[in-house]
Interface confidence: low
């Protein structure tokens, strides 16, 4: 139904707390350099205005669209051009072009310092003094670093953060209570961020149809007892929610997500038997829980997929009459039978099936032509299965850090032109797939591994788009989203690369490395490893292991020495010489 005042409608639907949180996220994602205080002031002004409209929907400007209202606020910020450069040009445009312009200026890798967590005592003090401001800072800091973070889900993580602080700040040993819990939330939030970014990339690059196909596959796996009409309805709604969030329409997105959760809980009988525990929770927890609910038990008597999609004499007729519906039912039927496949794999199979029908239905004897299509799926299925086995075996042998290093070497050889920080970030993220997925039961490994890798590689593509330096990466990133991971896996050593000359300063370290946290130490060592590979792209695994072991030994010795500085300045050059010799 149409509302006289959109802003009043959303304020009423969402309530003041969520309304303010979402407006803060929206502003922080658009203008990523502004301070919390600047944004908090704008949020308060928007909220006061919304309340005016709730009181009187006919009041001045209450009938304006949210984009107009928010855009006008952003464009009124002083020193916009000085701080944001050409983003200020967006303000010369009219809606909807102005919002599109803001979206195009979102920066996936803003030059902001890492979000440092204060020590426990200080955190608890500021949390107790003003919980609302504390959580506002959290929303602001995460949103500006992750401009496509799924807004309603960020509210959920803020709520988790709040609950952890409430619990741990009452304990005697705040630090040991907070650290593991907040680390857990951070890890989950970072994964959520890359997954959502992948969804927005799918929407931006390939449109709603591509996203809807992803949703049909994913929902069919999770709800194999829901009928195709139900899955289509859920996929349509989910597509709308994600389109809104990716497009910066965060109030609409959160409102529609709440509606979708309500619908699912009211229609459990026709969706899944596993929803009840989610549906008993309050809104943010309910929607989060539904988004990762376990798969329902598959119907016992599903007929073989071949019956309707290969053996049926009407295949070409059904395909010609309604291509999208027929392919949709294929994707639905195949996905509900294969919760053990990744969504990426299911979409590749659907694409292969479509290509086969396109070719065969134009021939004299279509059934003879498409009769072998299911057998032709085999290599497409085997490839990711082998990838999972090989990589999980390697992870089990090396552990997370060693596995990250193996991936770092592999990817530096594939794309040595890519900047070392990007390679290290990618390898560390790709390496976490082991910890995240390889410990799962066999039937859950493939979907976990491949869909996570796809999301991480999407980030690699986004960062590379800013400064394209590798033809290998450009080639893999230009194709379809579902082909990216196989494309990256198939890359070999880049033969066109001219090795970097050996610079001693790249491998010169100082005693300050000794006091760094373990994670930072690892990053320093991994940076050196990537630089070594760039110097000698064809170095063997043994050579690299020798050098890295020597390096680790050097750090251990010097960090234990009484006079660390002297040790680093005398042993360092010896290490560099030994490295050069080992790689010669």
């Amino acid at each position: 139904e149409a509302h006289k005042s959109e802003i009043a409608h959303r304020y009423n639907d969402l309530g003041e707390q969520h309304f303010k949180g979402l407006v803060l996220i929206a502003f922080s994602q658009y203008l990523q350099k502004c301070s919390y205080d600047e944004h908090a002031k704008l949020v308060q002004e928007v909220t006061d205005f919304a309340k005016t409209c709730v009181a009187d929907e006919s009041a001045a400007n209450c009938d304006k669209s949210l984009h107009t209202l928010f855009g006008d606020k952003l464009c009124a910020i002083p020193n916009l051009r000085e701080n944001y450069g050409e983003l200020a040009d967006c303000c010369t445009k009219q809606e909807p072009e102005r919002n599109e312009c803001f979206l195009q200026h979102k920066d996936d890798n803003p030059s902001l310092p890492p979000f440092e967590r204060p020590e426990a005592e200080a955190m608890c003090t500021s949390f107790k003094e003003n919980p609302t401001t504390f959580m506002g800072h959290y929303l602001h800091e995460v949103a500006r670093r992750h401009p496509y973070f799924y807004a309603p889900e960020l509210l959920y993580y803020a709520e988790q953060y709040n609950e952890i602080l409430t619990q741990c700040c009452a304990e005697a040993d705040k630090e040991s209570c907070l650290t593991p819990k907040l680390d857990g939330v951070k890890e989950k939030a970072l994964v959520s961020s890359v997954r959502q970014r992948m969804k927005c990339s799918s929407m931006q690059k390939f449109g709603e149809r591509a996203f809807k196909a992803w949703a049909v596959a994913r929902l069919s796996q999770t709800f194999p007892n829901a009928d195709f009409a139900e899955i289509t309805k859920l996929a349509t709604d989910l597509t709308k929610v994600n389109k809104e969030c990716c497009h910066g329409d965060l109030l609409e997105c959160a409102d529609d997500r709440a509606e979708l959760a309500k619908y699912m809980c009211e229609n459990q009988a026709t969706i899944s038997s596993k929803l009840q525990t989610c549906c008993d929770k309050p809104l943010l927890k309910k929607a989060h829980c539904l988004s990762e609910v376990e798969h329902d038990t598959m119907p016992a008597d599903l007929p073989a997929i071949a019956a309707d999609f290969v053996e049926d004499q009407e295949v070409c007729k059904n395909y010609a009459e309604a291509k999208d519906v027929f392919l949709g039912t294929f994707l639905y039927e195949y996905s509900r039978r294969h919760p053990d496949y990744s969504v990426s794999l299911l979409l590749r199979l659907a694409k292969k099936y479509e290509a086969t029908l396109e070719k065969c239905c134009a021939e004299a004897n279509p059934p003879a032509c498409y009769g072998t299509v299911l057998a032709e799926f085999q290599p497409l299925v085997e490839e990711p299965k082998n990838l999972v086995k090989t990589n999980c075996d390697l992870y089990e042998k090396l552990g997370e850090y060693g596995f990250q290093n193996a991936i770092l070497v592999r990817y530096t050889q594939k794309a040595p032109q890519v900047s070392t920080p990007t390679l290290v970030e990618a390898a560390r993220n790709l390496g976490r797939v082991g910890t995240k997925c390889c410990t799962l039961p066999e039937d859950q490994r493939l979907p976990c591994v491949e869909d996570y890798l796809s999301a991480i590689l999407n980030r690699v593509c986004l960062l590379h788009e800013k400064t394209p330096v590798s033809e290998h990466v450009t080639k893999c990133c230009s194709g379809s989203l579902v082909e990216r991971r196989p494309c990256f896996s198939a890359l070999t050593v880049d033969e066109t690369y001219v090795p970097k000359e050996f610079k001693a300063e790249t491998f010169t370290f100082h005693s300050d490395i000794c006091t760094l946290p373990e994670k930072e130490k690892q990053i320093k060592k991994q940076t050196a490893l990537a630089e070594l590979v760039k110097h000698k792209p064809k170095a063997t695994a043994e050579q690299l292991k020798t050098v890295m072991d020597d390096f680790a030994q050097f750090l251990d010795t010097c960090c234990k020495a009484a006079d660390k500085d002297t040790c680093f300045s005398t042993e360092g050059p010896n290490l560099v010489t030994r490295c050069k010799d080992a790689l010669a």
Partner: nanobody, 124 residues
């Protein structure tokens, strides 16, 4: 406007087969924007979904796992009606049986049309 007219016996003996029909007007049983369900309600079990059928370039049928072996739902396109057959009934199957059409529309999502319900008692 969609209307569902149910018919069938009110009393069935144990071990016999219960048969109900649901005549549809205002929509087609083979239309591609609806799904046709049977649901029952009893004091002991509450509201219970039994199964559904719908057409999307072929017929799909789904049953509640607990009734899989005893239940058959069919659509008759020539009569534009839905039928339910539940075999080997016991007093536990005593309930009000509803025929429910779920209609999917692009924007507003789904809305349901319910039949008036048939009270079925299983007793000798």
């Amino acid at each position: 406007q969609v209307q569902l007219q149910q018919s069938g016996p009110g009393l069935v003996k144990p071990s016999q087969t219960l048969s109900l029909t649901c005549a549809i007007s205002g929509d087609s049983v083979s239309g591609n924007s609806a799904a046709w369900n049977w649901i029952r309600q009893s004091p002991s079990r509450g509201l219970e979904w039994l199964g559904r059928t719908y057409y999307r370039s072929k017929w799909y049928i789904g049953y509640a796992a607990s009734l899989q072996s005893r239940l058959a739902i069919n659509a008759d396109t020539s009569k534009n009606q839905l039928s339910l057959r539940l075999s080997s009934v016991t007093p536990e199957d005593t309930a009000v049986y509803y025929c429910v059409g779920r209609h999917y529309s692009g924007h507003s999502g789904a809305f349901d049309t319910w039949g008036h319900g048939t009270m079925v008692t299983v007793s000798s």
